[in-house]
Each structure stands twice: as structure tokens, then as C-alpha cells.
Amino acid sequence: FGISGKHFITVTTFTSAGNIGEDGTLSCTFEPDIKLNGIVIQWLKEGIKGLVHEFKEGKDDLSQQHEMFRGRTAVFADQVVVGNASLRLKNVQLTDAGTYTCYIRTSKGKGNANLEYKTGAFSMPEINVDYNASSESLRCEAPRWFPQPTVAWASQVDQGANFSEVSNTSFELNSENVTMKVVSVLYNVTINNTYSCMIENDIAKATGDIKVTDSEVKRRSQLQLLNSGP
């Protein structure tokens, strides 16, 4: 027991997605070891020579770090002793997508696990009543998506109805020429009904709900990442 390298330790990663232009997290946990100085964390990326990040002897060691990750990575140093080897990634780019390996060595042994990291853009939709239209309509807007998503409308009253004939969806390229703004308008809506605007690509699914009554408008939005988990 306790001879480094002789035993395997459990390392767990979670498939995750990064939103380009924002912070991302590559999730990795391992069996804790109270001896911080004995813990080595190495992050590697398939197809990249050099390391994404290395943490050892209680501090970062960037001597072998690949240039594309310079100044963009950090572990949560205060959480390493409790078994958190997750990596914070600054300014996620499309090119950060790929297969990563989280390799751990402690006084108890060593282990590693792979994770698939997807990158794209996803954002919460906002639905508003469009009073400018000739008939009452709803406007669903989401500022940043990539790859191009699908957009579908649904209604609580007319469950199963196909709204493609009474809606119009457009995709407008944003200033950085990668992500797009999604705008979808649903026409001929009726009051005392709840409508949902669903935006989905292979990374995320977002839903915006709006309930329109005579006296008020209620909104709710949610976003879920797809295929995230161990």
C-alpha cells in the first residue's frame, strides 16, 4: 500500500461543453489525498504535443505547457486536496473541442480518465409580445448560438400542433463572424395560453416560455447542456 504508481486510483471525468468567448470547466475528480505535495495533475489533449496544464508539488508547472493554452488555464488549487482536479479554461475557442485526458498521481497510486469537450455557443432565449405586428405575435430572441440550431414552437393549449407555417425564424451572424443571433416570430397567438420557443443544437437545448393573459405576461427560460455527464 501507498507505493506511488503501484495501485490504480479512481479518476472520474464529465463530458462537458464550452461556450465560446467565456470561461469553461473541464471536470475531473479523484480519490482525495491529504498530502498536497504528493499530488500531480496533468491535463493532456489528443493531437497536441506538450501539456494543457500541470499542477505538482502544490503549484502550477507550465514548463511543458502548449502555447495555445498559455495564460488560459488554472486548477482550483484550494480544492485539489479534496479530490478536485477540474481545469478552468479562459476564453473558450472552437478549436478547444476534442478529447482531453485527466491524469492523476498521488501517494495512493495513479489513474486517468478521458473526456469529450464540445465547444459552441448557446444562450437563453427571451420571448416578448410583439405589439408592432399587424396581428398579435410573439418574438423569441437568443443572442448567441453555434452551430446553427433548430427552432420550434409549442403551445400548452394546442399540444402537438405544428407551428412552422405560422412562424418565421432568422439567423443573423454576429460581429465576430462565428456565432449567430436567433430570432423567431410566432404569428396569430391567442391569449390565455402558454407558448414555448425551443432552440436546440448538438450542444445545448434552451426553452423560453411565455404565458399571456388579459392582465399579465409571465416568462420563464431554461438552458440545458446535452450529453453532459460521466
Epitope: 465560446i20 468567448g21 467565456e22 470561461d23 496544464h53 503549484k59 502550477d60 508547472d61 507550465l62 514548463s63 505547457q65 498559455r70 495564460g71 488560459r72 488555464t73 488554472a74 488549487a77 478552468r88 479562459k90 476564453n91 448567441r144 454576429n174 460581429s175 465576430e176 456565432t179
Partner: antibody
Framework: EVQLVQSGAEVKKPGASVKVSCKAS????????IGWVRQAPGQGLEWIGD????????NYNEKFKGRVTITRDTSTSTAYLELSSLRSEDTAVYYC??????????????WGQGTLVTVSS | DIQMTQSPSSLSASVGDRVTITCKAS??????VAWYQQKPGKAPKLLIY???TLQPGVPSRFSGSGSGRDYTLTISSLQPEDFATYYC?????????FGQGTKVEIK
């Protein structure tokens, strides 16, 4: 408590060089990037460049490339800014600042008191 | 390189006023915009980073927002100690860049 203490004011002649120091304490010096920013009299802030003391990696503003060198001495937890071929427009207060986020290059969260460099014939 | 265009360059306001300062990035998208306050003869002080995260110890009357190329610093109710010069900083790319600054003066 994070502290950055800079060297004293300097008066230099045009064409000369100046080296400003920034001694860090209160945190692990090799784990955080240190940046340099200058401010000419009555003007705004201008980013010069930064260094990761743990490996000596540097980034420079294109405007200063070839004239500026940022170095560090890990044994004394000190970062240095050297600016050569000085001209009158280089007269400014030079600040060092620690970047938040350890090896992740964040925003500048702790600043030195500033060093006035005057270039005059 | 990304340039940050800050406006206005100066403004006059009274105690209790709501003040808004904007910065526009020349290109790209990322959330790495910070805001600083600087008083005469002093080093800048970090107020907000990552577009909207308040630095510990900074009063909640300061807030940041923005997306795409447009970012905003708002002071909800100006206090006497808030009269100073404010700068935005873009720090998402390899090369950092400050805005030109906005001087907030007493009306």
C-alpha cells in the same frame, strides 16, 4: 495581504534606458502573472505587457516591442520592466499589477504605488 | 489587436444620479471586460471583472453588463466618493487594452 512595492522615481536623458522594479509579497510570486501599465501626465492607462514568473513567459504590446523587456527574479520575488531608447513621450507613471486567476491571465487586481519616470534633456 | 472605445470622455453629475459609462470593443466577442476607478495620484482600483462580477469590497451600487461588443458600467446612485476617472479593460485576448477613460465630475 498582497503587496507590490515599486522602486523610486527616475530622471533619464533621451536615448537612455530605465529599469523599474516591483517587489511582491503576501502571495506565491511564481503562481500569478504580473503586468505593467503606464500613464502619461493627464492621460489614460496604457498596457505595456506581462510576465508569468513561474516560467518567464511574456506578452508585449506591439507598440513597445523591441524597446521593452520584462523579467523576473524568483529568488527575491521581484519583477522588472526595462525600457530602452527613451524619448520625452515615455515620461509617465509606470505601474506593476498582479493579474487575478493564478496561471490563468485575469484582470489586474492588486497594484503597486507607481514609479514616475521623467525623460528630459 | 482589439481596441476599446469608451464614452463619454467626461460627464458632470450630481450626488444621487444614475451614471452609465460604455465601452465598445472593435471586434470579437468575449466576456473579459473589467472596470477600474482611479483617483488623482492613486493607482487604479478594480471594481468589476468578467463583465459583471463585483470585486469583493466594492459597493453594490456599481454594476456591469454587456455582451457582444458593447459593455456598460452603471453607478446606480452616485456618491461623493465616486467622483473619479473610470477605465474599461479588455483582457480576453493575448494583448490587453484599456479604454480612454471617463472622468466623472461634480455638476
Amino acid at each position: 495581504e498582497v503587496q507590490l512595492v515599486q522602486s523610486g522615481a527616475e530622471v533619464k536623458k533621451p536615448g537612455a534606458s530605465v529599469k523599474v522594479s516591483c517587489k511582491a509579497s503576501g502571495y506565491t510570486f511564481t503562481s500569478y502573472w504580473i503586468g505593467w501599465v503606464r500613464q502619461a501626465p493627464g492621460q489614460g492607462l496604457e498596457w505595456i505587457g506581462d510576465i508569468y514568473p513561474g516560467g518567464g513567459y511574456t506578452n508585449y504590446n506591439e507598440k513597445f516591442k523591441g524597446r521593452v523587456t520584462i523579467t523576473r527574479d524568483t529568488s527575491t520575488s521581484t519583477a522588472y520592466l526595462e525600457l530602452s531608447s527613451l524619448r520625452s513621450e515615455d515620461t509617465a507613471v509606470y505601474y506593476c499589477a498582479r493579474l487575478d486567476g493564478s496561471s490563468y491571465r485575469g484582470a489586474m487586481d492588486s497594484w503597486g504605488q507607481g514609479t514616475l519616470v521623467t525623460v528630459s534633456s | 489587436d482589439i481596441q476599446m472605445t469608451q464614452s463619454p470622455s467626461s460627464l458632470s453629475a450630481s450626488v444621487g444620479d444614475r451614471v452609465t459609462i460604455t465601452c465598445k470593443a472593435s471586434q470579437g466577442f468575449n466576456k473579459y471586460v473589467a472596470w477600474y476607478q482611479q483617483k488623482p495620484g492613486k493607482a487604479p482600483k478594480l471594481l468589476i471583472y468578467y463583465t459583471s462580477t463585483l470585486q469583493p469590497g466594492v459597493p453594490s451600487r456599481f454594476s456591469g453588463s454587456g455582451s457582444g461588443r458593447d459593455y456598460t458600467l452603471t453607478i446606480s446612485s452616485l456618491q461623493p466618493e465616486d467622483f473619479a476617472t473610470y477605465y474599461c479593460l479588455q483582457y480576453g485576448n493575448l494583448l490587453y487594452a484599456f479604454g480612454q477613460g471617463t472622468k466623472v465630475e461634480i455638476k
